[in-house]
Structure formats: structure tokens, C-alpha cells
């Protein structure tokens, strides 16, 4: 007799979730020698321990601490790239600019990127049918709490000049309710972070507006300045050109460096 299972509004755990996490962990430690000390079986056990047998609307950051401890990793100063609502371009950028890192270039972010997971209270099963939706069910679900936890840690450990890529095509270029706006901005440490530099990515080809003057960017500047961190903003008018110039900086059309305005 199939046992009763809570029906949530969100999609269920990604198929082959344990295998995917383990495979990613192995691949990551193979490719990043500095993480060779990581035992992927222990990482999976800690990951599993954070949500298995727990009510999936009552997950806490504390549940993820054993995993966070195992995945401890530092980014060199000036090399942290945050992003909001523009993940693909941020990842394309760090794939080319190999010495800069988004959260998904770090072990824990890499493990969980694009995956969904949840368990059930008092059973050892993974729920492949449905998981809580952040809006319709609850915010303290395994996936949301994971990203809040690791995003907080990522921001806390950043130092030097921190960069953030923002989507200029959205109505709120800076959204206080995004992970960047609600978690990362507030966890940058003023004693370690000298400045936040925002890169506003333009969507339209003929869009020559200065989006650094957008009210939401001004709001971001205000929040950052109040935290005693300097703020800079750049328009990236042609993201395709921008990536091309990162790949080939010697290209004659890249030498002028006139693709963006720069604001203090």
C-alpha cells in the first residue's frame, strides 16, 4: 500500500539527485586540487543530513552547517562575482575569466546549481513527487534555505573589490527581495570589502541609457554607502561584445574601453 505523501506546489527532487551531487563533488575535487582533502561521501552524508527526515517547511541554516563546514573555501580578494537575475552571463564570464568566481564556481554552489531536493518528516525517503514552493508553500524549504546559507557565507568571506552583475532589462535592476538584495548585500563585511562595483547589463542593442542612474541602483548605492563600502557602477552596453573582449582583450575594437560609463 503506497503511504500517504504530502503534496507540495513545487516540482519534486531532481531525478538521480544523490548520484548527481556525488558525481559533481568528485568532478569538482578532481579538477580543483586545492579541494582534494574533501571526502565526497562525507559531503553527501552532510547534505543528506540537512533535509532527510525533516519537515521540509522547517529547515534552518543550522541544518546546513555540517555541510558548510566541509565545503569551506576561500576566494582571493577582488575575485568575487555576485549576480542577480543574470546567472548565465555571469557564468559565461567566469568560464572565460578563470580567476573570478561566482558562488556556483565554488564547491557547494556547483553541487546544487539547478537542482531541487526535499525529504519528508520522519522517513528516510527523498520526495521525488513534489517539494515546497517558496511563494505558495513556505520560504524555509530545503532549497531556499541552502541558497540563503551559502550565499550569506559567500558574501561574508568576500574581500577587496566585490563585483556584481545586474540585469538592466528588468523593471527592478536592483531588487531588495533577490538573494543579492536580501542576503549578500547585508553580509559584505565593511572591514574587508573596500568597494562594490555593479555591472549593469543592457538588453537592447540600441539601448544607450545610463542605467547607473536608475532609482534602484541609487537605492543600492545608498544601502552600500551606509555600510561604509564604496560604490561604483558601470554600464555594459553590449554583453556579447563584453564577453568577446574578455576572451580576446588584444582585439583592436576592445582597446578603446568605451563600452561603459563609470560612476562613483
Amino acid at each position: 500500500v503506497p503511504r500517504w505523501r504530502q503534496q507540495w506546489s513545487g516540482s519534486g527532487t531532481t531525478s538521480r539527485f544523490p548520484e548527481t551531487v556525488l558525481a559533481r563533488c568528485v568532478k569538482y575535487t578532481e579538477v580543483h586540487p586545492e579541494m582534494r582533502h574533501v571526502d565526497c561521501q562525507s559531503v553527501w552524508d552532510a547534505f543528506k543530513g540537512a533535509f532527510i527526515s525533516k519537515y521540509p517547511c522547517n529547515i534552518t541554516e543550522e541544518d546546513y552547517q555540517p555541510l558548510v563546514k566541509l565545503g569551506t573555501q576561500t576566494v582571493p580578494c577582488n575575485k568575487t562575482l555576485l549576480w542577480s537575475r543574470i546567472k548565465d552571463l555571469a557564468h559565461q564570464f567566469t568560464q572565460v575569466q578563470r580567476d573570478m568566481f561566482t558562488l556556483e564556481d565554488m564547491l557547494l554552489g556547483y553541487l546544487a546549481d539547478d537542482l531541487t531536493w526535499c525529504g519528508e518528516f520522519n522517513t528516510f525517503e527523498i520526495n521525488y513527487q513534489s517539494c515546497p514552493d517558496w511563494r505558495k508553500d513556505c520560504s524555509n524549504n530545503p532549497v531556499s534555505v541552502f541558497w540563503k546559507t551559502v550565499s550569506r557565507r559567500f558574501a561574508e568571506t568576500a574581500c577587496g573589490v566585490v563585483h556584481v552583475m545586474l540585469n538592466g532589462s528588468r523593471s527592478k535592476i536592483f531588487d531588495k527581495n533577490s538573494t543579492f538584495g536580501s542576503v549578500e548585500v547585508h553580509n559584505l563585511q565593511p572591514e574587508k570589502v573596500q568597494a562594490l562595483e555593479a555591472w549593469v547589463i543592457h538588453g537592447g542593442r540600441e539601448d544607450s541609457r545610463d542605467l547607473c542612474q536608475d532609482p534602484t541602483i541609487k537605492e543600492l548605492e545608498s544601502i552600500i554607502s551606509k555600510r561604509n563600502i564604496r560604490f561604483f557602477c558601470k554600464n555594459i552596453y553590449r554583453p556579447d561584445k563584453f564577453l568577446q573582449c574578455v576572451k580576446n582583450p588584444e582585439d583592436s575594437s576592445c582597446l578603446s574601453g568605451i563600452h561603459h560609463h563609470h560612476h562613483h
Epitope: 548520484e19 568528485v26 565526497c40
Partner: antibody
């Protein structure tokens, strides 16, 4: 005791493909990375790639990307290495190899006996 | 990819003598280095991993040292069964790469 037993010698024509098998016994197969290493006559060793059967996860050396496919059949504890578009330079002894530790494939404690593949017209 | 260079290509040693084999990496591989022994018609056999840790069942006369780019395999007193080809292998960066080998022959 772990044993890796490979399929027999093969003679192949240029342009064709070869599929070498490696059957593991004496240990739990699925969690261990099976690697393939080749050695041309009188030459050194060359790592080609690896698979972790349980994770269905294969990785290849850039040199062989697109020409080599490593697969595994968990039910028979057998790994396979298929090399396509064969040329005379692919004449070599092909070894499967495994590490002691589950999941990892850094260095190799256990080796198959080797399979000689000769490519000749 | 990381290029591993072994020297000498051939080493002639009398039984009972000490043999010192060298392996150099084109860039740092930390301590992620292994040594293998291979006899004619046989598969390689793991001797050392982690640059200096002896594999299970390997006699104490085999020792490894070094880190970064310079590594050494020392056989303190050569026995007749030690005459073979020795390979180093780095497992720091994809793809894993081997040296071209050092043949230890009877003098």
C-alpha cells in the same frame, strides 16, 4: 581480492572501431572509478579517461574527446572502452585500472592484464 | 597539460647498489604524484602515491620524496626483481599524465 579481466587481442582496419571490455570481480563494482590507460609498443603510459559506474559519469582526456566512449554495465560489473576512427598510431596495449578508494581515480592499485589492439590495413 | 620528464632514460646499476630516479613536472603538482614499476609483458604496479607513501605490500627499500615540481624515487638496495621500467604519474591536473619512463637495467 580485486581482479580486472580484459577481453582478448583485436586486429582492426584503419577507420573502424574497437570495443574492449574489463570485467571486475572480488569487490563492489559500482562505486569505483574504472580508468583506461594505453601503451603504444615500446612507449610510455597514456591516461585516456575514466568512468564511475554508479554515477554514470565519464571523463576523457582532451586528446581522445569525441573518439573514445567509456561505458559500464553495473549488472555484469563490466566496463567498456570504445575507440573509433582508428589509425595506425592507436596500435597499443589498452589497460583498465582501478583505485583502492571508492569514487576517486587519482592513482591505480589494480590493473587488468591488458588488451593488445593492432590497427593495420 | 602537465608534462612529466623522467631522468635518466636508462640507469645501469649493480644488484645491491642504490638507484635514484628523477621526475620533474612542468608545473607544480603539489604532492599529487605516484610511481609505478612495469616489467616486460606485465601491467604496471603501484609503488608510491602522495609522492612518499608506499602502496600496500611494497618493500621498504622503495622510497619516494619531493613536492612541487621535483620528485625522486629511491631504491636503497637493488634486488634482481627490481630491474624494470619505472614511471611517475601526476594526478594534480586533468588529464593525468605519466613520465616517459626510466629503465633500470643490470650493470
Amino acid at each position: 581480492q580485486v581482479q580486472l579481466v580484459q577481453s582478448g587481442a583485436e586486429v582492426k582496419k584503419p577507420g573502424s572501431s574497437v570495443k574492449v571490455s574489463c570485467k571486475a570481480s572480488g569487490d563492489y563494482f559500482n562505486n569505483y572509478a574504472i580508468n583506461w590507460v594505453r601503451q603504444a609498443p615500446g612507449q610510455g603510459l597514456e591516461w585516456m579517461g575514466r568512468i564511475i559506474p554508479f554515477l554514470d559519469d565519464a571523463n576523457y582526456a582532451q586528446k581522445f574527446q569525441g573518439r573514445v566512449t567509456i561505458t559500464a554495465d553495473e549488472s555484469t560489473s563490466t566496463a567498456y572502452m570504445e575507440l573509433s576512427s582508428l589509425r595506425s598510431e592507436d596500435t597499443a596495449v589498452y589497460y583498465c585500472a582501478r583505485a583502492t578508494s571508492p569514487l576517486y581515480s587519482y592513482y591505480f592499485d589494480y590493473w587488468g592484464q591488458g588488451t593488445l589492439v593492432t590497427v593495420s590495413s | 597539460e602537465i608534462v612529466m620528464t623522467q631522468s635518466p632514460a636508462t640507469l645501469s646499476v649493480s644488484p645491491g647498489e642504490r638507484a635514484t630516479l628523477s621526475c620533474r613536472a612542468s608545473q607544480s603538482v603539489s604532492s599529487n604524484l605516484a610511481w609505478y614499476q612495469q616489467k616486460p609483458g606485465q601491467a604496471p604496479r603501484l609503488l608510491i602515491y602522495g609522492a612518499s607513501t608506499r602502496a600496500t605490500g611494497i618493500p621498504a627499500r622503495f622510497s619516494g620524496s619531493g613536492s612541487g615540481t621535483e620528485f625522486t624515487l629511491t631504491i636503497s638496495s637493488l634486488q634482481s626483481e627490481d630491474f624494470a621500467v619505472y614511471y611517475c604519474q601526476q594526478y594534480n591536473n586533468w588529464p593525468w599524465t605519466f613520465g616517459q619512463g626510466t629503465k633500470v637495467e643490470i650493470k
